[in-house]
């Protein structure tokens, strides 16, 4: 089987959503957990994570081969405390398989803005913290 994990971010007003998306086959879901860690380069686990989610066992319909499961971690207002390195991971409690997404970072600047970097190649998001706009 092939399980794919991606990281993304979206902004709604002053809120920042950090999103871990896992694509997987129905039969691969059992025992799988997706989780988001901060500043945990070596020991990212569900126990040390900011948030965790069991993968969907059922896509809700039968005419699909793959299921998308999405973990969303919402920061209502980004502060300097949120600066750091984040990583989406997944682990099977059944088979021991472990997946690690790319590291991405939130950098809070002195001007009160913040940037999110490393989500995808060539993708660099810069958010204005005060005005809540994508610049």
């Amino acid at each position: 089987g092939c399980i794919n994990i991606t990281s993304s971010a979206s902004q709604e007003g002053t809120r920042l959503n950090l999103i871990c998306t896992v694509w997987h086959k129905k039969e691969e879901a059992e025992g799988f957990v997706v989780f988001l860690c901060k500043d945990r380069s070596g020991d990212c686990s569900p126990e040390t994570s900011l948030k965790q989610l069991r993968l969907k066992r059922d896509p809700g319909i039968d005419g699909v081969g793959e299921i998308s499961s999405q973990l969303m971690f919402t920061i209502s207002q980004v502060t300097p405390l949120h600066s750091g390195t984040y990583q989406c991971c997944a682990r099977s409690q059944k088979s021991g398989i472990r997946l690690q997404g790319h590291f991405f970072s939130i950098l809070f600047t002195e001007t009160g803005n913040y940037t999110v970097t490393g989500l995808k190649q060539r993708q660099h998001l810069e958010f204005s913290h005060n005005e809540g706009t994508l610049s």
Epitope: K26, R54, K56, D58, G60, I61, D62, Q70, L71
Partner: antibody, heavy 121, light 107 residues
């Protein structure tokens, strides 16, 4: 044993909103899609939408998108269906139903007893 | 969306007779079709899953067949308690949809 218990009958005026609850017991609430279906007097079954409590993924039929809101509270194993801007045509029995696990059951194997909504001025 | 068309709308039969109900999908849905029975004042009850698979507790006189776009629910010998409305439902794609129903009434 699996049980779905819905809230009681409601009488609402046109333009108002209603929130129907469906309390689940006897299974792992987060692992199964909860469906919402309605049936107008003397009519067939109409699917409104479904929610997966594990990650709050919700799907709606086009007709109800923007007017129906499905939510789920994992701490109480309760699903909710809120319908806004009510009109007389919304008078119906509203059911919650659990979809059995894909490829094993797939159909709606357990149903609530139904909640009667009457919209009248 | 996938439209399910049930026929006939009403079936008038006597106890002991064989009932054949049809459900046609507007596009291929493999075997992703389920059948329900509903009696007045009651919630529907799942009879057949995935076109032809039996459900525990449902009498053996109920059987289903078909794949793709054409499906059939057969009641081999009608019992008095079988007079009800029957619905088909597809789980192939969003939005999920029901057929309009077939009422099986006593002749």
């Amino acid at each position: 044993q699996v049980q779905l218990v819905q809230s009681g009958a409601e009488v609402k005026k046109p333009g108002a909103s209603v929130k129907v609850s469906c309390k689940a017991s006897g299974y792992t609430f987060a692992d199964y899609w909860m469906q919402w279906i309605r049936q107008a007097p003397g009519q067939g079954l109409e699917w409104i939408g479904a929610i997966y409590p594990g990650d709050d993924d919700a799907q709606y039929t086009q007709k109800f998108r923007g007017r129906a809101t499905l939510t789920a509270d994992k701490s109480t194993s309760t699903a909710y269906m809120e319908l806004s801007s009510l009109r007389s045509e919304d008078t119906a029995v509203y059911y919650c139903a659990r979809r059995g696990i894909a490829a094993v059951v797939g159909g709606f194997d357990y149903w609530g007893q139904g909640t009667t909504l009457t919209v009248s001025s | 969306e996938i439209v399910l068309t049930q026929s006939p709308a009403t079936l008038s039969l006597s106890p002991g007779e064989r009932a054949t109900l049809s459900c046609r999908a507007s596009q291929s849905i493999s075997n992703h079709l389920h059948w329900y029975q509903q009696k007045p004042g009651q919630a529907p009850r799942l009879l057949i899953k995935y076109a032809s698979q039996s459900i525990s507790g449902i009498p053996a006189r109920f059987s289903g067949s078909g794949s793709g776009t054409d499906f059939t629910l057969t009641i081999s010998s009608l019992e008095p308690e079988d007079f009800a409305v029957y619905f088909c439902q597809q789980s192939n794609s969003w939005p999920l949809t029901f057929g309009g129903g077939t009422k099986v009434e006593i002749k």
